[in-house]
Interface confidence: medium
Amino acid sequence: SAPGEDEECGRVRDFVAKLANNTHQHVFDDLRGSVSLSWVGDSTGVILVLTTFHVPLVIMTFGQSKLYRSEDYGKNFKDITDLINNTFIRTEFGMAIGPENSGKVVLTAEVSGGSRGGRIFRSSDFAKNFVQTDLPFHPLTQMMYSPQNSDYLLALSTENGLWVSKNFGGKWEEIHKAVCLAKWGSDNTIFFTTYANGSCKADLGALELWRTSDLGKSFKTIGVKIYSFGLGGRFLFASVMADKDTTRRIHVSTDQGDTWSMAQLPSVGQEQFYSILAANDDMVFMHVDEPGDTGFGTIFTSDDRGIVYSKSLDRHLYTTTGGETDFTNVTSLRGVYITSVLSEDNSIQTMITFDQGGRWTHLRKPENSECDATAKNKNECSLHIHASYSISQKLNVPMAPLSEPNAVGIVIAHGSVGDAISVMVPDVYISDDGGYSWTKMLEGPHYYTILDSGGIIVAIEHSSRPINVIKFSTDEGQCWQTYTFTRDPIYFTGLASEPGARSMNISIWGFTESFLTSQWVSYTIDFKDILERNCEEKDYTIWLAHSTDPEDYEDGCILGYKEQFLRLRKSSVCQNGRDYVVTKQPSICLCSLEDFLCDFGYYRPENDSKCVEQPELKGHDLEFCLYGREEHLTTNGYRKIPGDKCQGGVNPVREVKDLKKKCTSNFLSPEKQNSKSN
């Protein structure tokens, strides 16, 4: 039988009546066009909905938009279009929502062709009121908030000017011209690239990287011959053209661009690219594209300096620049990432790492599944996960994998069971241990979401027909109940729940179609009465993360420590609640050689945990640039893996070697930098 349909499934009592009392319909007095939804703040219940409708006339396109606001998690909406003077809002800019709980919102309006500048509507009270502001420029990008101060905004203009506001968009100042890309760094710092000879495209590879730490009063050039730059964790990366040819290399800085080091990564040619897949304050996952139009490359993981890289995964699927990769951070368990590789036979397979890229393996075959037609051996196969690439290929995959930091261990994804990803209709699988083991959760493709920190999982079947049924589970996907939320089926367009998975409300969006009109409609269901009591201590159980052999003393040790969590028992039907905090208990592990990566000039032979000196570098000057200066690099051949907290145990000691280096790439060195003031 399908999961959840056997006798062992306990029923949630009287759920139909409980849910019916907590189902709220809102029909939008609107022609169907496009709809976008934004949550304003955390735990505020405020949702803004922007509907837009385009009527193509003979000479021009006439646009109309409406703005709605809810302050009860979507149960009721009020039309507040009059607060923005019934202005047409440009959907490509979306709704720019301020960081944290600032309550700030910026909407960018469509203006007539001959106007001097654009127009924005600003709110700093969770969209209760808006102020209209005319801009001295036409915006090219959405307004970007400084992460440290929501009053500071930056935007690029259609004429490549960099504009900054210090009073939440009331007054704007152009701080620099000829700007290609601008990003906020930490401490209200702005990094941006500039061109000298005409355009961003023409000067690609000859751009300059600038920094201002005082919102445009003074500037410092921190790099030249720049192709592009990126920020990840505490690292600033620049892709820099080589002196002699058309290749480029990654340089990295951990001091906001004052000093740079050349990353020990392969250089790339014109048709190739680098991509920061994930970054935190400890380390970086970097993808380096293979030469030629292969659609794959190599993942490298960095040391704590972002300089030394270890090869992590070969043949990593990543189509052209800005294309698709399935790389997914499993946020419900530390150290876990999932991605796809392109096999020699061009089939796509899913790989998972539990130790931040140290080792990759296939996903274990779900107990309750058979191997499909892609499997050579019907008894031996793996689970393969559908992610961005499958979605881009228009496979029947409505959603990417889902995990939430406060729903510990839970991962939900579409997948197929075989030797490779299948083009057949996928099913939905769930893991409750961060990806170590999997179970088929639902037959066929579904939309899904996590509520109440994992206490409830909600799903809706992906269908081309109108729907009126929602499924929910209170035991991490083992058993499912179905609830008919409306008599009249709707064409479903999306599930919406508050980011962070703490809410108990879910909104089902769709449209109704009649002979004359089609209208947007939302149904918001509150599950609070299903989980009628608050969880108590007895509802939780101790769970050791990354446990593969409970008797082994080192069991659960990942990156030098193990963590035990208090997790809700599957049998407990209760509310974690909005204030739920994940209870975890870390303890330090003994160090092993696996807690270390090989330093520059060293490598690990296959199936060996010891680092040995690279033969080709013995006695050679190293093309290695530390802070852009000529100096000696001392190393014992090992470096602690970033974020690894192990103590004692193995302490790899070896004679310290002087690695004499020559700096072949010093065009980012301090003496080449200059400053100027406005």
Epitope: L544, P550, Y553, Q647
Partner: antibody, heavy 118, light 107 residues
Framework: EVQLVESGGGLVQPGGSLRLSCAAS????????MSWVRQAPDKRLEWVAI????????YYSDTVKGRFTISRDNSKNSLYLQMNSLRAEDTAVYYC???????????WGQGTLVTVSS | DIQMTQSPSSVSASVGDRVTITCHAS??????IGWLQQKPGKAFKGLIY???NLKDGVPSRFSGSGSGADFTLTISSLQPEDFADYFC?????????FGQGTKVEKR
């Protein structure tokens, strides 16, 4: 029945050496980390050293580092503590203790007395 | 090193009394604390692990509470076999460290 039995204690002069043993039975010895803990005459407990289940990784308290060596022989279900350069302050009852991944001192032996005196 | 300060060093009590022993860690240790019992001539016995979890076979009159830096062992109704020495131990970080011990004796 899960059991740990220490042996090898005795009287030794300062600067001397001693080797303690701990025989384990009633559980799969090779899957547990093992520790030595000592109790001074004033009843204070001090953790001395730990060894991982496979024997690859060891860790020592600063007071014994460089003088004591913990080791194990999983084929014999035995844990050892080689004590060199003994000092008067090493006088104590020495206990071996089992560590699982969930709980670090869940089974103890009866202890063996080591007296360092001239 | 993390210091574990245990108090009181001794407590006089009668059968049926509620006894409370506390341990303070010099820095946060999450719930990485265990409580041990020592009786003369007997091996140490583990009572509580991870601050609050009762080891299998230990009577429910023993309970642990606290997290972070302050922890408590409570014997809700003292029984004759409970007169013994009690120690806390932290295992959040190497080196593992013990409290000075609390002697529970007959009043």
């Amino acid at each position: 029945e899960v059991q740990l039995v220490e042996s090898g204690g005795g009287l030794v002069q300062p600067g001397g050496s001693l080797r303690l043993s701990c025989a384990a039975s009633g559980f799969t010895f090779s899957t547990y980390g093992m520790s030595w803990v000592r109790q001074a005459p004033d009843k204070r407990l001090e953790w001395v050293a730990i060894i991982s289940s496979g024997g690859s990784y060891t860790y020592y308290s600063d007071t014994v580092k460089g003088r004591f060596t913990i080791s194990r022989d999983n084929s014999k279900n035995s844990l050892y503590l080689q004590m060199n350069s003994l000092r008067a302050e090493d006088t104590a009852v020495y206990y071996c203790s089992r560590s699982s991944s969930h709980w670090y001192f869940d089974v103890w032996g009866q202890g063996t007395l080591v007296t360092v005196s001239s | 090193d993390i210091q574990m300060t245990q108090s009181p060093s001794s407590v006089s009590a009668s059968v049926g009394d509620r006894v409370t022993i506390t341990c303070h860690a010099s820095q946060g240790i999450s719930s990485n604390i265990g409580w041990l019992q020592q009786k003369p001539g007997k091996a140490f016995k583990g009572l509580i692990y991870h601050g609050t979890n009762l080891k299998d076979g230990v009577p429910s009159r023993f309970s642990g509470s606290g997290s972070g830096a302050d922890f408590t062992l409570t014997i809700s109704s003292l029984q004759p076999e409970d007169f013994a020495d009690y120690f806390c131990v932290q295992y959040a970080q190497f080196p593992y460290t013990f409290g000075q011990g609390t002697k529970v004796e007959k009043r």
